[in-house]
Amino acid sequence: QPPPPPPDATCHQVRSFFQRLQPGLKWVPETPVPGSDLQVCLPKGPTCCSRKMEEKYQLTARLNMEQLLQSASMELKFLIIQNAAVFQEAFEIVVRHAKNYTNAMFKNNYPSLTPQAFEFVGEFFTDVSLYILGSDINVDDMVNELFDSLFPVIYTQLMNPGLPDSALDINECLRGARRDLKVFGNFPKLIMTQVSKSLQVTRIFLQALNLGIEVINTTDHLKFSKDCGRMLTRMWYCSYCQGLMMVKPCGGYCNVVMQGCMAGVVEIDKYWREYILSLEELVNGMYRIYDMENVLLGLFSTIHDSIQYVQKNAGKLTTTIGKLCAHSQQRQYR
Amino acid sequence: SAYYPEDLFIDKKVLKVAHVEHEETLSSRRRELIQKLKSFISFYSALPGYICSHSPVAENDTLCWNGQELVERYSQKAARNGMKNQFNLHELKMKGPEPVVSQIIDKLKHINQLLRTMSVPKGRVLDKNLDEEGFESGDCGDDEDECIGGSGDGMMKVKNQLRFLAELAYDLDVDDVPGNNQQATPKDNEISTFHN
């Protein structure tokens, strides 16, 4: 094995290199010293390093490591951040369009139900947006509230236009009757199923993307342990203490050091793989009633059908409700 | 049949979020994301190698540094940690991940669990005509999963039809709707992706 070349007798080369790391030369010895105070770059003979230099090298090594991690994750991070933003905005746009379609349907088919219908539709879609973003709202309650609110207006404006519209008493009775009599048939249940399934999937999809960002950010900003810092310093910088400025670390040695430094990070691997494959499975299933775009943009049509269903059964319903809510109506007419 | 508010459906200005081709659908965009994400499947296992390949490492030189001395690149000493006695690599590995890494692993486990439970079982909603019509109340049987709702031409044939809309400088309003009674069936322009 070749003997190591003698260190630069004046530490001149080491000084000029170190000056790039740390302007101000007071830490570099003029000539090689014993280096008995060194803790990382333990010398076999005279050395051009001091304890302070060693500390600076450790800091630089850890910074290098952080920068390398950040450059490794740059494209991946951009991919997830960009897509999370794109999908969040796209989902909001879908909700906005679904609301506009539904309002347009009311305006063009049931002008007498506006503006109250607009108000209820607006509240429903606001809840949809909040749910997607993680709010603790129950989808069935949202749908029930929409139909509970709509029925009194449909009853007083379409089915029984002679009734004065200011009475809260009959509204309460009508809201109750809506569920008891299954006024809208199976449509509310159908909408609940479709909306809850599609929104759940959408919500978890966005949650997963946001967690992806968190995972990358965590590894991006990892603080490496002191032991790791020392190993990196020995690998990248200790050769300089011997004046070996141009020598590079051995490949196998680098791999061993990195495995040690990154043992914890590499443990993420198994769960990261599972994350990508599980997300793929979810995405493969996001169609038809599991696709919020499909479901929400078709809601106006299903709501229209549900109103038609009410109109079709109007005669029967008016009689039944007349008896059921008679007390409320009498109080109203007085 | 329900009035289909056709001009609300994009009105020539294309909803294009983050510079996505206007023919693109949410569905194709999702598949594109997954295909790209899958290329990062080895991200964590490949990190140590990445760091070494992006930092100075002896490739063509005959001599290299093993942490303690200059050695020949292919000698046994080249891969060995030059100062074994100073601190133990094995110990470093045994310490286990940082608390912040353990925390993120727990979060990944949780989301993976959620993703698996939310995934649609294979064949669950397959082989059904997307454009099924003639729905009457009670037509769905016990499981409304199979229902898409809608009657006759009132049924909007929606399959990922929201095209990506450009920055949306305006907000579509109900008052923009003229009273025409057209039914729109947008094309389902999806790019070709996986064919297993």
Epitope: M74 | K38, S39, F40, S42
Partner: antibody, heavy 119, light 107 residues
Framework: EVQLQQSGPVMVKPGPSVKISCQTS????????IHWVKQSHGKSLEWIGL????????NYNQKFKDKATLTLDTSSSTAYMELNSLTSEDSAVYYC????????????WGQGTSVTVSS | DIQMTQSPSSLSASLGGKVTITCKAS??????IAWYQHKPGKGPRLLIH???TLQPGIPSRFSGSGSGRDYSFSISNLEPEDIATYYC?????????FGAGTKLELK
């Protein structure tokens, strides 16, 4: 060291099909996409499609959908591309390339396989 | 498909000089552009990905920049081994597309 070793040049008559191989080493085969790219004489590069050894999924450029079939043998870490109904238009150099890890870009390429279709 | 318009198609430069190649995409490609060096009889070699990230072992004489639809690639302090054809590749879209190539020659 990452390597993609492609099969040697082939000369075939128009009509039948030809199968070219891309043997890989130096990385975990199942973790990376294998893409195929065509370069006709004096022309630029054209993407044909990709295969993902992890799950066998493929994705084709529509232009080559009926021309190329991408397959794998994971036991030998080898990717294959079969070109069918050969015509002189298919005469070109075909490259396999690896993508993934830290970018979706094609980061390592094979040396290319020259296919000449001539009667 | 996304078209990549690469220019110039050929250029000659002196050793030690600087050259710049540009690629214009038909739509925003979100920084998903890579640059390759291609020599006869070999496979292309990736120099830069994601607009400006240098591959390991590639000298810092090579650089890339740009955003949106417009991207450029430069080689400074030209050396004899840089003589080759250079291609850009967009990988924003799943259907990857290359530029037509730039043949670099010595003056």
């Amino acid at each position: 060291e990452v390597q993609l070793q492609q099969s040697g040049p082939v000369m075939v008559k128009p009509g039948p099909s030809v199968k070219i191989s891309c043997q890989t080493s130096g990385f975990t085969f199942t973790d990376y996409y294998i893409h195929w790219v065509k370069q006709s004489h004096g022309k630029s590069l054209e993407w044909i499609g990709l295969v993902f050894p992890y799950d066998g999924g493929t994705n084709y450029n529509q232009k080559f959908k009926d021309k190329a079939t991408l397959t794998l043998d994971t036991s030998s870490s080898t990717a294959y591309m079969e070109l069918n109904s050969l015509t002189s238009e298919d005469s070109a150099v075909y490259y396999c390339a690896r993508a993934g890890g830290f970018s979706y870009a094609l980061n390592y390429w094979g040396q290319g396989t020259s296919v000449t279709v001539s009667s | 498909d996304i078209q990549m318009t690469q220019s110039p198609s050929s250029l000659s430069a002196s050793l030690g000089g600087k050259v710049t190649i540009t690629c214009k995409a038909s739509q925003d490609i979100n920084n998903y552009i890579a640059w390759y060096q291609h020599k006869p009889g070999k496979g292309p070699r990736l120099l830069i990905h994601f607009t400006s990230t240098l591959q390991p072992g590639i000298p810092s004489r090579f650089s890339g920049s740009g955003s949106g639809r417009d991207y450029s690639f430069s080689i400074s302090n030209l050396e004899p081994e840089d003589i080759a054809t250079y291609y850009c590749l967009q990988y924003d879209n799943l259907l990857l597309t290359f530029g037509a190539g730039t043949k670099l020659e010595l003056k």
